[in-house]
């Protein structure tokens, strides 16, 4: 490339690489790379790889526009996942015969273990794997609000698909709300969209780990694919560091 | 400001001002400022000011994140508005006694007059003015699809308000679709959100220019505030210019 | 758009996204990031000429604003437009961590 | 953020948004734009130091990345981050036109 003076492409690349070295450590709030002396031998644990792949898949589907980056968003976010309370739990009993909806409950103490304080949460996604399907359906997501009431969160038009497909809903606000309350069981309802004059109010979508027809409860494989919350949060120690050094340059 | 060499702030400002001179003309695809010899004397017409104010209000509520700007988006967009077909039109007759919804019909020939070709449309917003209200309601917007079917477009949770408030829905895709079809009457339905087990399916929101209780059809004032489409489009002559010069730098 | 599709397949001299793959072990001497082994970081490079609007060929000058100085800057600069995050896996002591780093991959550039 | 709230009320020497009001008649000699009479265009200015990671005071250096070179550029540059459009009214012959110009007002800046 030539401008007024010739650009040394190799120097630019070297400077970019050096800057990335600092950028990664800076985003992780590490003064130096972590030592590998204590790393257990062998491949990465299955669950860690699954979590990494979930995150990578999310990135691939993410819009690539640069978002203005507040200080807290510059830093890396730890990714964890919290599985839905097992279907055998008694909490599901009263939802058995409802045809327009399926229900997913979560233990907020599991969420709090991953995200000790509400402001640390940067994003929470509810992930559901739908089985392949030949029908189109308009579906809605609700949050359990009080004893028997549900608050509308969002909707999706699900088109037919030949392969199982992961659905993702942004539930950051809801999870932050849960973290502000005491521990307990909280939940979501995934429903058919019932319009004011519609007659067919049956949910035709089948969700892995919930839909009774093909539970396939074969331990781990089923476990990996049952609905879960994907959480992105600032680790507590990084947040404390952030808080204590909140001064301007 | 001082870096290695002192920055001449006045020079920077002058260069920025000169660049803006070029930028505005460039965005309007004008080689020079338009002559003012033919401009009618007196203030701007009422309707033009109303349209300008609508656009300015929209900007104020708009997120200020930079959106990646494809070539077509760099250029200025002409703003026009198309009012809803008057409520006295026979097309509204069959919608009179429906309590869960209100209906808004538009003449696509009016839209085509403003936007002669579908690709020229850059954004279309449906604007409704709701009266002040003490109730919270979850509402939905539908597009007329075929004879008696409606396609879901979006929803909004409307909270109580002490003052009349403008609601805005992005209907760009719908209007582009209409432009691709022949002329005729097309419409939207604004409904209460009816959940699968909800009993109260009445729309409590009152919309200026529609809600029968307080029509106040007093010519212009009412006319200004009845539902309309706010259209942003590349003017035809600018688009032709664009098309002919689509080469890379 | 000055994106990977256009820039990687052209010999654009002006502002464009340039290819750069970073191998953590080879380029940074790091073996602590377990996944991925590297990533396409890319970078923006190339001039964004400041356009003097007093140029005699004014209509030609105006056509250049779109690419060279769309933001009407006093000194336009070639910078990232679209960015993507990068998830990584690393260990802290014996504990594996999955973290997401925002704005790590340059997908397109712009004069700003 | 390096936005109007922070930058207009500080004497920041590094990258920041700077105040600039453009009066169409006075600054550009134009009377053809009927509305608005002018607008707060603003602009970005100030250094974004490139940070060498071989600096001995490394932990201090890392803390500066966030502001000075968050995108890990080889030569970071002070550019607009948040922009807003500007609607204008002007005449073409006898016909008034309302048009919206995208990305005209600089609300905040960043090192990129």
């Amino acid at each position: 490339l030539s401008t007024c003076k010739t650009i040394d492409m190799e120097l630019v690349k070297r400077k970019r690489i050096e800057a990335i070295r600092g950028q990664i450590l800076s985003k992780l709030r590490l003064a130096s790379p972590p030592s590998q002396g204590e790393v257990p031998p062998g491949p990465l644990p299955e669950a860690v790889l699954a979590l990494y792949n979930s995150t990578r898949d999310r990135v691939a589907g993410e819009s690539a526009d640069p978002e203005p980056e507040p200080e807290a968003d510059y830093y890396a976010k730890e990714v964890t996942r919290v599985l839905m309370v097992d279907r055998n739990n008694a909490i599901y009993d009263k939802t058995k015969d409802i045809t327009h909806s399926i229900y997913m409950f979560f233990n907020t103490s599991d969420i709090r273990e991953a995200v000790p304080e509400p402001p640390l949460l940067s994003r929470a996604e509810l992930r559901l794997q739908r089985f392949k399907s030949t029908v189109e359906q308009h579906v809605e997501l609700y949050q359990k609000y009080s004893n028997n009431s549900w608050r509308y969160l969002g909707n999706r038009l699900l088109t037919p698909t030949d392969t199982p497909e992961w659905l993702s809903f942004d539930v950051t606000g809801v999870v932050r709300q849960w973290l502000n309350q005491g521990d307990g069981i909280q939940g979501f309802r995934f429903s058919a969209h019932c319009s004011c004059d519609s007659k067919d109010n049956v949910l035709h979508v089948e969700i892995n780990g919930i839909s009774p027809k093909r539970r396939g409860d074969l331990g781990t494989i089923h476990d990996m694919n049952r609905p879960f919350l994907l959480l992105m949060a600032t680790p507590l120690e990084r947040a404390q560091h952030l808080h204590s050094s909140r001064h301007r340059r | 400001l001082s870096t290695c060499k002192t920055i001449d702030m006045e020079l920077v400002k002058r260069k920025r001002i000169e660049a803006i001179r070029g930028q505005i003309l460039s965005k309007l695809r004008l080689a020079s400022p338009p002559s003012q010899g033919e401009v009618p004397p007196g203030p701007l017409p009422e309707a033009v000011l109303a349209l300008y104010n609508s656009t300015r209000d929209r900007v104020a509520g708009e997120s200020a994140d930079p959106e990646p700007e494809p070539e077509a988006d760099y250029y200025a967009k002409e703003v026009t508005r198309v009012l809803m077909v008057d409520r006295n039109n026979a097309i509204y007759d069959k919608t009179k006694d429906i309590t869960h919804s209100i209906y808004m019909f538009f003449n696509t020939s009016d839209i085509r007059e403003a936007v002669p070709e579908p690709p020229l449309l850059s954004r279309a917003e449906l604007r409704l003015q709701r009266f002040k209200s003490t109730v919270e309601q979850h509402v939905e917007l539908y597009q007329k699809y075929s004879n008696n079917s409606w396609r879901y477009l979006g929803n909004r949770l409307l909270t109580p308000t002490d003052t009349p408030e403008w609601l805005s829905f992005d209907v760009t895709g719908v209007v582009r679709q209409w432009l691709n079809q022949g002329d005729g009457i097309q419409g939207f339905r604004f409904s209460a959100h009816c959940s699968c087990d909800s009993k109260d399916n009445v729309l409590h929101v009152e919309i200026n220019g529609i809600s029968p209780k307080r029509r106040g059809d007093l010519g212009t004032i009412h006319d200004m505030n009845r539902p309309f489409l706010l259209l942003m489009a590349t003017p035809l002559e600018r688009a032709q210019h664009l098309h002919s010069s689509r080469h890379r730098r | 758009a000055l994106d990977t599709n256009y820039c990687f397949s052209s010999t654009e001299k002006n502002c464009c996204v340039r290819q750069l793959y970073i191998d953590f072990r080879k380029d940074l001497g790091w073996k602590w990031i377990h996944e991925p082994k590297g990533y396409h970081a890319n970078f923006c490079l190339g001039p964004c000429p400041y356009i003097w609007s007093l140029d005699t060929q004014y209509s030609k000058v105006l056509a250049l604003y779109n690419q060279h100085n769309p933001g009407a800057s006093a000194s336009p600069c070639c910078v990232p437009q679209a960015l993507e995050p990068l998830p990584i896996v690393y260990y802290v002591g014996r504990k594996p961590k999955v973290e997401q780093l925002s704005n790590m991959i340059v997908r397109s550039c712009k004069c700003s | 953020a390096l936005d109007t709230n922070y930058c207009f009320s500080s004497t920041e020497k590094n990258c920041c948004v700077r105040q600039l009001y453009i009066d169409f008649r006075k600054d550009l000699g134009w009377k053809w734009i009927h509305e608005p009479k002018g607008y707060h265009a603003n602009f970005c200015l100030g250094p974004c130091p490139y940070i060498w990671s071989l600096d001995t005071q490394y932990s201090k250096v890392l803390a500066l990345y966030n502001q000075h070179n968050p995108g890990a550029s080889a030569s970071p540059c002070c550019v607009p981050q948040a922009l807003e459009p500007l609607p204008i009214v002007y005449y073409v012959g006898r016909k008034p036109k309302v048009e919206q110009l995208s990305n005209m007002i600089v609300r905040s800046c960043k090192c990129s």
């Epitope: 590490l30 790379p33 030592s35 002396g37 204590e38 120690e237 | - | 790091w30 014996r94 | 071989l54």
Partner: antibody, heavy 118, light 107 residues
Amino acid sequence: EVQLVQSGAEVKKPGASVKVSCKASGYTFTSYWMHWVRQAPGQGLEWMGRIDPQSGGIKYAQKFQGRATLTVDTSTSTAYMELSRLRSDDTAVYYCARWDYGGYFDVWGQGTLVTVSS
Amino acid sequence: DIQMTQSPSSLSASVGDRVTITCRASQDITNYLNWYQQKPGKAVKLLIYYTSRLHSGVPSRFSGSGSGTDYTLTISSLQPEDFATYFCQQGDTLPWTFGQGTKLEIK
């Protein structure tokens, strides 16, 4: 201020055991692993082992496996190192040191001299 | 275990001198090399970690460099308080191992 304060000097007979304490202050005790390092008179430093106060996970250098026992009391932010079956060549200054995940010891105790003599 | 060989084992120098101590590892330790200062009756102090990073509060006359198996600690201009024993330590692979020390004395 981050500090590690160790117990006082000990004199022990061969075959006996010694338990050295290390009280941490100025930081969250469970957030950092505690390591133990010793230094025989006129010699270099020798790593003995470490404990994770949060999980209780322990790792010993092979040489001290079976003879050293590391424990913590999180309620008092104190780490302990017990060495049994003492021999005269165990005479040394014993240090506790806070480990940073970067692979270095950023804070050290002042040391505890243990003398093994009959 | 990785062997750490430090040299010299002792050295005499004067205030204002530039001093260099080296440390060689028996295998590549990928920059996980740290330097400590020890004074009689005082707690050991971390000076430099990860080859060249200065620990907070350490004067900038101390610097580190190196890669692979060979590393260096440099004191650019000796001060009276710098006379002490210096140790290197590798943080790459368990068990953590130290050099045998370099005693820096006043000439």
